[in-house]
């Protein structure tokens, strides 16, 4: 097995992930592993020399960079919060704070905004990934209601009066629950006509 540095006439290396072509010497050299950087470039007689990234810096991939990337914080003012710290091999992992979605993306989320409220009679469609997009409000399905303006409230099933030994006084809608009454209670005058069938 050939180990770097080795000559390459066609400008390609056997292991593209862990080696790179150095055009000045027309050789293939080792890349540095994640968490390290190039402290001395390769030559015909000596392979790449790597060194560990200093504190508060990282390199995520096999590389031939002469510096490490600076760790960046998750800025709360931009709606972000940290979920995992920066290491020598991985940048700080950020997400949107609760009740927010990513509103600006440049390789990673840079700015979050508050999720829109869903009006009464609707709920936010459940997403595969939290924080990925703004709310898409969908109507409550039959037999369910939601009576607030909220980014997170879920549609609830209408109360079944009979389960509580009561009778229905007014049917539920998408925005309101069923109204129940005692079977012995007299009906209000305006409703008595509709109930005497």
């Amino acid at each position: 097995q050939v180990v770097p540095p080795y000559g390459s006439e066609n400008q390609t290396c056997r292991d593209q992930e862990k080696e790179y072509y150095e055009p000045r010497h027309r050789i293939c050299c080792s890349r540095c592993p994640p968490g390290t950087y190039v402290s001395a470039k390769c030559s015909r007689s000596r392979d790449t020399v790597c060194a560990t990234c200093a504190e508060n810096s990282y390199n995520e991939h096999w590389n031939y960079l002469t510096i490490c990337q600076l760790c960046r914080p998750c800025d709360p003012v931009m709606g972000l919060e940290e979920i995992a710290p920066c290491t020598s091999k991985r940048k700080t992992q950020c997400r949107c704070q609760p009740g927010m979605f990513c509103a600006a993306w440049a390789l990673e989320c840079t700015h979050c905004e508050l999720l829109s409220d869903c009006p009464p009679g609707t709920e936010a469609e459940l997403k595969d990934e939290v924080g990925k997009g703004n709310n898409h409000c969908v109507p409550c399905k039959a037999g369910h209601f939601q009576n607030t303006s909220s980014p997170s409230a879920r549609c609830q099933p209408h109360t079944r009066c009979e389960d509580q030994g009561l009778v229905e006084a007014a049917p539920g809608t998408a925005q309101s629950d069923t109204t129940c009454r005692n079977p012995s209670e007299s009906l209000p005058p305006e409703m008595s006509g509709t109930m005497l069938m």
Partner: nanobody, 112 residues
Framework: DVQLVESGGGLVQPGGSLRLSCKAS????????FGWYRQAPGKQRELVAT???????WYDVSVKGRFTISRDNAKNTVYLQMNSLRPEDTAVYYC??????WGQGTLVTVSS
């Protein structure tokens, strides 16, 4: 918008300690991450410490090991415990969060 009131600054000798407080109103406190920022004379405002909703903390390398950020959700308050203070820590300190109004800040002066 979120209102923030910082307090606890003052004049302290090098090596001394201070505890800054930040009282927040106008938001669901437990749903917000917070940061402490500072601005030294003639310099840009910089982020020095953050705390997430879950209590995860981040510190700038210049304060790591000396400063501690914490939160008390019951009191709607974020704290910054500052130990082993140095003259270069002299600045106006602010706390802030999403849609927070920048307050007056609290001045920390480290001098002998």
């Amino acid at each position: 918008d979120v209102q923030l009131v910082e307090s606890g600054g003052g004049l302290v000798q090098p090596g001394g300690s201070l505890r800054l407080s930040c009282k927040a109103s106008g938001t669901t406190f437990s749903d917000r991450a917070f940061g402490w920022y500072r601005q030294a004379p003639g310099k840009q405002r910089e982020l020095v410490a953050t705390i997430s909703t879950a209590g995860l903390t981040w510190y700038d390398v210049s304060v790591k090991g000396r400063f501690t950020i914490s939160r008390d959700n019951a009191k709607n308050t974020v704290y910054l415990q500052m130990n082993s203070l140095r003259p270069e820590d002299t600045a106006v300190y602010y706390c802030n969060t999403f849609r927070g109004n920048w307050g007056q800040g609290t001045l920390v002066t480290v001098s002998s």
